[in-house]
């Protein structure tokens, strides 16, 4: 029995930040779970982890240097990534593991989300301001 995951096919991070919502075919509220976000076709980089236990506060962390936060809905986890670099444009996969109560459950691999990070384009200020209007 596998949990199904839905995520947007593509997101654009215009301001070097993005909200990626992982929607599950499963209610997480009465479970101990580990939701994670992975970068790359081979999911080699674990970007962010949200650990939940119905009786405790949510734990959110990254062991790979990403600036991330997480929010829990009853059938979703939203990852908020900030300070992304242009070269972190890639495909990102949501993963969910239900640790307790048994049995252990995880998800069918999702299609992933391509996050396209657009660099900040600062408009150069003119060297000489135009004539002021009366």
């Amino acid at each position: 029995n596998k949990i199904l995951v839905k995520q947007s096919p593509m997101l654009v991070a215009y301001d070097n930040a993005v909200n990626l919502s992982c929607k599950y075919s499963y209610n997480l509220f009465s479970r101990e779970f580990r939701a994670s976000l992975h970068k790359g076709l081979d999911s080699a980089v674990e970007v962010c982890v949200v650990y939940g236990n119905y009786s405790q506060q949510l734990q959110v962390y990254s062991k790979t240097g990403f600036n991330c936060d997480g929010k829990l809905g009853n059938e979703s986890v939203t990852f908020y990534l900030q300070n992304l670099y242009v070269n972190q444009t890639d495909i990102y996969f949501c993963k969910i593991e239900v640790m307790y109560p048994p049995p252990y459950l995880d998800n069918e691999k999702s299609n992933g989300t391509i996050i396209h990070v657009k660099g900040k384009h600062l408009c150069p200020s003119p060297l000489f301001p135009g004539p002021s209007k009366p």
């Epitope: 209610n27 009465s30 119905y54 009853n74 048994p102 049995p103």
Partner: antibody, heavy 121, light 107 residues
């Protein structure tokens, strides 16, 4: 077809012990939690605890710790509940039931027929 | 531990009437609640899970509602086979306590 077959009625003396069985069939035994529930005459249902045969995980209601012990035999797909130091308060019908996970919401859709335990000298 | 307060304890009604049984908890259980029917000398039968989801094969005259700490089981146009005991049970951690039960009798 999922079936939980419980052992027959027991008449036991005060202070004695009894072992009740719940034999599962029609599904993969190690993939589901089995709950135990007590029903005393004229009273309501009381949750005793659960046992997960896949990893031998157990949860007890604090009220039944020291009274009930849950075990299983995977080879016969059977979960056991041993009750010790029996008193008249333990006279009841005991049910086993399978927990199903409905996409993250739990419930007990399959129940055994119950075992009547009578404690009397 | 979560306390389950089920009311009323007993109810005497006529065939065709509508009844509502309620279950209140002392903390939010996020709809992790089931309802069972039990007839004399029989095993309990699951009617509703996740507070509102009707089990396949259970007549549509049974319905569950509620959220947070307040939940209800409603039976419309009662049939003679509906008489018996009804229990709610939470699954928000352990112990998975049952409500005290409601005895539904024919008037």
């Amino acid at each position: 077809i999922v079936k939980l077959q419980q052992s027959g009625a027991e008449l036991v003396k005060p202070g004695a012990s009894v072992r009740l069985s719940c034999k599962a069939s029609g599904y993969t035994f190690t993939e589901y939690i089995i709950h135990w529930i007590k029903l005393r005459s004229g009273q309501g249902l009381e949750w005793i605890g659960w046992f997960y045969p896949g990893s031998n995980d157990i949860q007890y209601n604090a009220k039944f710790k020291g009274k009930a012990t849950l075990t299983a035999d995977k080879s016969s797909s059977t979960v056991y509940m041993e009750l010790t130091g029996l008193t008249s308060e333990d006279s009841a019908v005991y049910f086993c039931a399978r927990r199903d996970d409905f996409s993250g919401y739990d419930a007990l859709p399959y129940w055994g027929q119950g075992t009547m335990v009578t404690v009397s000298s | 531990d979560i306390q389950m307060t089920q009311s009323p304890a007993s109810l005497s009604v006529s065939v065709g009437e509508t009844v509502t049984i309620t279950c209140r908890t002392n903390e939010n259980i996020y709809s992790n609640l089931a309802w069972y029917q039990q007839k004399q000398g029989k095993s309990p039968q699951l009617l509703i899970y996740a507070a509102t989801h009707l089990v396949e094969g259970v007549p549509s005259r049974f319905s569950g509602s509620g959220s947070g700490t307040q939940y209800s089981l409603k039976i419309t146009s009662l049939q003679s086979e509906d008489f018996g005991n009804y229990y709610c049970q939470h699954f928000w951690g352990t112990p998975c306590t049952f409500g005290g039960g409601t005895k539904l009798e024919i008037k």
